[in-house]
Interface confidence: medium
């Protein structure tokens, strides 16, 4: 038994043009969640299968609101580790899926909005009890930086957390300070004690008395950030014991190659030799296969049988994107004619037609006057998707059924008196005024 731990360092726009400013729109505040799913690495299960090794969810991130015009700050991330406990042996090779989700806060039509911003997947080799492994993954325009490790929970030990070491009350053949291990009585294991003072956050050891540093830290006890380290030798060796990193313009400084790639200097820059399953300038692209289940929304994964061959997602109707992760906005094609309102219901496309039009795409122009009679000698006028009656004098209303009082609206200005007449209305103007409506 043990725990897989994932630490998210940063999530934000990746390098290059076209990268978004921030995951939040300027309109609404939002917060992020991270979700991790683990599966035994050699399993052929698709992403839709349960996370056989376990899954975890980060705490809710702090609420973030983008300030228009202000420089984009580092996005506030959820606190703490994502921890996935495992009960059985650690498989050594595992597949992971890490999803970054955004929750938009505030009132909006259709309810709160959730978005899957990024989804990265990969397969890794990892021994339990080893140091933190660092990784950078890109998904579309986003970049996710994280570290992970697997550690055994006592009394389990070993690279797969399968050996049990329990101190026994009976005398043992193990020397002083050594623990007897079950099930092999004659196997003795020393408790791993790092060098005294070795930083618990930035250092680790694989041998007793050792202090090895995580990337970005140096010094005998791994307490010095590399940017502030000072070396006596101008180009001394990179070493956790001397606390020196090679300074200066060396393009391989700090090893820009991710995922265990090895860096070699070239006359102009550097070159990464990537391990199997990774590619890209810095070995940052993981060889995701169909076994990692990269296709969303019922997409069919083809090819990608091994990490060195690409996969293709064949998307079902209504979805697009390299992983079928985007819903096609079918309304953007403006399928509704004659000013109809388009409704994409997911399972179907509907058009809400304006009055006077019908059909699945509002393609039929109805005869607005069909079956519509205008009373009292009125005539029907078709147009604008609705029928209208042009009424004879003295009548009004939608169907000319109402007797019209032409004086009801008090049309005579400046105190003029209104008289209804068969041909319309007549204004008798007050002294000093003239005109059809006494307007002058």
């Amino acid at each position: 038994a043990g725990v897989f731990e994932l630490q998210i360092h940063s999530f934000g726009p990746g390098p290059g043009p076209g990268a978004p400013r921030s995951p939040c729109s300027a309109r609404l505040p939002c917060r992020l969640f991270f979700r991790v799913c683990l599966k035994p690495g050699l399993s052929e299960e698709a992403a839709e299968s349960p996370c056989a090794l376990g899954a975890a969810l980060s705490a809710r991130g702090p609420v973030y609101t983008e300030q228009p015009g202000a420089p984009a700050p580092d996005l506030p991330l959820p606190d703490g580790l994502l921890q996935v406990p495992f009960r059985d042996a650690w498989p050594g090779t595992f597949s992971f899926i890490i999803e970054t989700w955004r929750e938009e806060l505030g009132d909006q039509i259709g309810g709160p909005a959730w978005s899957l911003l990024a989804r990265v997947a990969g397969r890794r080799r990892l021994a339990a009890g080893g140091p933190w492994a660092r990784d950078i993954q890109r998904a579309g325009a986003w970049e996710l930086r994280f570290s992970y490790r697997a550690r055994c929970e006592p009394p389990a030990v070993g690279t797969a957390c399968t050996r049990l070491c329990r101190p026994r009350s009976a005398p043992s053949r193990c020397g002083p300070g050594l623990r007897p291990c079950a099930p092999l009585e004659d196997e003795c294991e020393a408790p791993l004690v790092c060098r005294a003072g070795c930083s618990p956050e930035h250092g680790f050891c694989e041998q007793p008395g050792e202090c090895r540093c995580l990337e970005g830290w140096t010094g005998p006890l791994c307490t010095v950030p590399v940017s502030t380290s000072s070396c006596l030798s101008p180009r001394g060796p990179s070493s956790a014991t001397t606390g020196c990193l090679v300074p200066g313009p060396g393009p391989c400084d700090g090893n820009p190659c991710a995922n265990g790639g090895s860096c070699s200097e070239t006359p102009r820059s550097f070159e990464c030799t990537c391990p199997r399953g990774f590619y890209g300038l810095r070995c940052e692209v993981s060889g995701v296969t169909c076994a990692d289940g990269p296709c969303f929304n019922g997409g069919l994964c083809v090819g990608g049988a091994d990490p060195d061959s690409a996969y293709i997602c064949h998307c079902p109707p209504g979805f697009q994107g390299s992983n079928c992760e985007k819903r096609v906005d079918r309304c953007s094609l403006q399928p509704c004619r004659n000013g109809g309102l388009c409704l994409d219901l997911g399972h179907a496309l509907r058009c809400r037609c304006r009055a006077g039009f019908a059909g699945p795409r509002c393609e039929h122009d109805l005869d607005d006057c069909a079956g519509r009679a205008c009373a009292n000698g009125g005539t029907c006028v078709e147009g604008g998707g609705a029928h209208r009656c042009s009424c004879a004098l003295g009548f009004g209303g939608r169907d000319c059924r109402e007797r019209a009082d032409p004086c009801a609206a008090r049309p005579c200005a400046h105190g003029g008196r209104c008289y209804a007449h068969f041909s319309g209305l007549v204004c008798a103007c007050a002294p000093g005024y003239m005109g059809a409506r006494c307007e002058f």
Epitope: L57, I109, W114, S115, N297, R327, L343, D344, G346
Partner: nanobody, 126 residues
Framework: QVRLVESGGGSVQAGGSLRLSCAAS????????MGWFRQAPGKEREGVAT????????AYADSVKGRFTISQDRAKNTVYLQMNSLKPEDTAMYYC???????????????????WGQGTQVTVSS
């Protein structure tokens, strides 16, 4: 694919209660959102309540807040809608729907849900 089967509908007097169930089968890992929607005769389908299945976050239409509760049993891949203090205007066909991971999911917008059940009728008489 995801298959959804609703049950629990029926007729009830105003002020009464009903509990709807929706059992999901198939590729349920990707059903990150499960919700209940309803459609009364001659009206548009509208969101009632939705659950973000992996964070236990919920959203309710204003008309049902305080009366309806959405919940889930993860082990059974089932989502429930407990409806209390029912009113005649709650009469409608109730549909269970699921949405997979997507670019954008508005929790009460039927257009953002890809998978739908056949529906179960709820009738509230005064």
């Amino acid at each position: 694919q995801v298959r959804l089967v609703e049950s629990g509908g029926g007729s009830v007097q105003a002020g009464g209660s009903l509990r709807l169930s929706c059992a999901a089968s198939g590729s349920t890992y990707s059903t990150n959102f499960m919700g209940w929607f309803r459609q009364a005769p001659g009206k548009e389908r509208e969101g009632v309540a939705t659950l973000v299945t992996w964070v236990e976050r919920t959203a309710y239409a204003d008309s049902v807040k305080g009366r309806f509760t959405i919940s889930q049993d993860r082990a059974k891949n089932t989502v429930y809608l407990q409806m209390n203090s029912l009113k005649p205007e709650d009469t409608a066909m109730y549909y269970c729907a699921a949405a997979a991971a997507s670019t954008d999911v508005r929790l009460l917008d039927p257009g953002d849900f890809a998978y739908w059940g056949q529906g179960t009728q709820v009738t509230v008489s005064s």
